[in-house]
């Protein structure tokens, strides 16, 4: 969390951002809140990016003002217009690109003053893994697949019964480049699994960590997966 204050002769207002990550090809949100004004006419929101000449986005006097917008963001940005009045300056970024990563500044002017805060935005690819029993294999084998990751992640297997065990000798992980030549499909196979046990396939890079669990018993198979973005720090 980054909290910024204004530094002009005018009063300062509090602006708060949260570091976040964008998933390539999907829409992302750059989060920013500020001390709200009671009227829309005096609110100005400017989003800037370090190293970029033009503005990322500008909203003033109740509408988007995009004449100074940088070409790389053309047609890809929007604020939540109905929430500006209650202090939400967050920016929706459409079709996140790898090159969108960097340091952004959320700069706010209201009738009460000015303020700004920086935000670190990481980009990459991350997806939920799915773990299945591989019935084609000669021995009991689990197959963990996740369709889109970048940068290349690490894959670690764990088991509830054999806590702390190292499965690197009995697992094999491959990375297959997807058609857009950036993201990769992750496939990891775990051999010699035992029933009545819960296995976890953990995929992690510097942006996200995802886990796929599978519980194999004689009567049923239960699956669960979750994904967590790393380094979501507020500012």
């Amino acid at each position: 969390l980054i909290i910024g204050f204004g530094i002009s002769g005018r009063h300062s207002i509090t602006v708060t951002t949260v570091a976040s990550a964008g998933n390539i090809g999907e829409d992302g949100i750059l989060s920013c809140t500020f001390e709200p004004d009671i009227k829309l006419s005096d609110i100005v929101i400017q989003w800037l990016k370090e190293g970029v000449l033009g503005l990322v986005h500008e909203f003033k006097e109740g509408k988007d003002e995009l004449s100074e917008q940088d070409e790389m963001f053309r047609g890809r940005t929007a604020v939540f217009a109905d929430q500006v009045i209650v202090g939400n300056a967050s920016l929706r970024l459409k079709n996140v690109q790898l090159t969108d990563a960097g340091t952004y500044k959320c700069y706010i002017i209201t009738s009460k003053g000015k303020g700004n805060a920086n935000l670190e935005y990481k980009t990459g690819a991350f997806s939920m893994p799915e773990v299945n029993v591989d019935y084609n294999a000669s021995s009991e084998t689990l197959r963990c697949e996740a369709p889109r990751w970048f940068p290349q992640p690490t894959v670690v297997w764990a088991s509830q019964v054999d806590q702390g065990a190292n499965f690197s000798e009995v697992s094999n992980t491959s990375f297959e480049l997807n058609s857009e030549n950036v993201t990769m499909k992750v496939v990891s196979v775990l051999y010699n699994v035992t029933i009545n046990n819960t296995y976890s396939c953990m995929i992690e890079n510097d942006i996200a960590k995802a886990t796929g669990d599978i519980k194999v018993t004689e009567s049923e198979i239960k699956r669960r997966s979750h994904l967590q973005l790393l380094n979501s720090k507020a500012s």
Epitope: E35, P36, K39, L40, S41
Partner: antibody, heavy 115, light 107 residues
């Protein structure tokens, strides 16, 4: 859930003052404006003013300056409005409403000014 | 001060009808207009903010449109529970101002 509790009614003498309360719960009181509005039968709604508890910023409708004074007690998440030198023109229902969108309204306090 | 004019004080309707309530601002308020519903004996309730954004939990038969000075609030198919007074309001500049209200009643 969000709640704004206001007393149902109050009877006051002409020339007197009254302090109306609005107790908030279910959200972070300090982070939203609290607005006050007046409704008289056949007159429509009028905005009196708003206060931002976190900073103490206050905005008044010029028409109500000198008539209404807005304050807050952040420790009890309560907003107050003082009305002074009351006349029959001040007889109305007074509402408190959360944030700049007036997204949630209290039930209103009926103020009757009568001798 | 910005004056918000609701041209109809009363509107008669039947259940299932499409109803359109208009509101005109005396100067440009961009899209900073909200619509509220007030039923008898109740406090007002936010339906639409920033011209066209339905507030949480508001049925999709309620819609809003417009920009600048002319705004419209539509109920696509009136239900019995929609009989109420509807107010427009601008939050573009202070003082914040409301329309006089349009009372929706049964024919």
């Amino acid at each position: 859930q969000v709640q704004l509790q206001q007393p149902g009614s109050v009877l006051v003498r002409p020339g007197a003052s009254v302090k109306l309360s609005c107790k908030a719960s279910g959200y972070t009181f300090t982070n939203s404006w609290m607005n006050w509005a007046k409704l008289r039968p056949g007159q429509g709604l009028e905005w009196i003013g708003g206060i931002y508890p976190n900073s103490g910023n206050i905005e008044y409708n010029e028409k109500f300056k000198g008539k209404a004074t807005l304050t807050v007690d952040t420790s009890s998440s309560t907003a107050y409005m003082d009305l002074t030198s009351l006349t029959s023109e001040d007889s109305a229902v007074y509402y408190c409403a959360r944030d700049s969108r007036f997204s949630y309204w209290g039930q209103g306090t009926l103020v009757t000014v009568s001798a | 001060d910005i004056v918000m004019t609701q041209s109809h004080k009363f509107m008669s309707t039947s259940v299932g009808d499409r109803v359109s309530i208009t509101c005109k601002a005396s100067q440009d308020v961009r899209t900073a207009v909200a619509w509220y519903q007030q039923k008898p004996g109740q406090s007002p309730k936010l339906l639409i903010s920033s011209t066209s954004y339905r507030y949480t939990g508001v049925p999709d038969r309620f819609t809003g449109s417009g920009s600048g000075t002319d705004f419209t609030f539509i109920i696509s198919s009136v239900q019995a529970e929609d009989l109420a007074v509807y107010y427009c309001q601008q939050h573009y500049s202070t003082p914040l101002t409301f329309g006089a209200g349009t009372k929706l009643e049964l024919k």
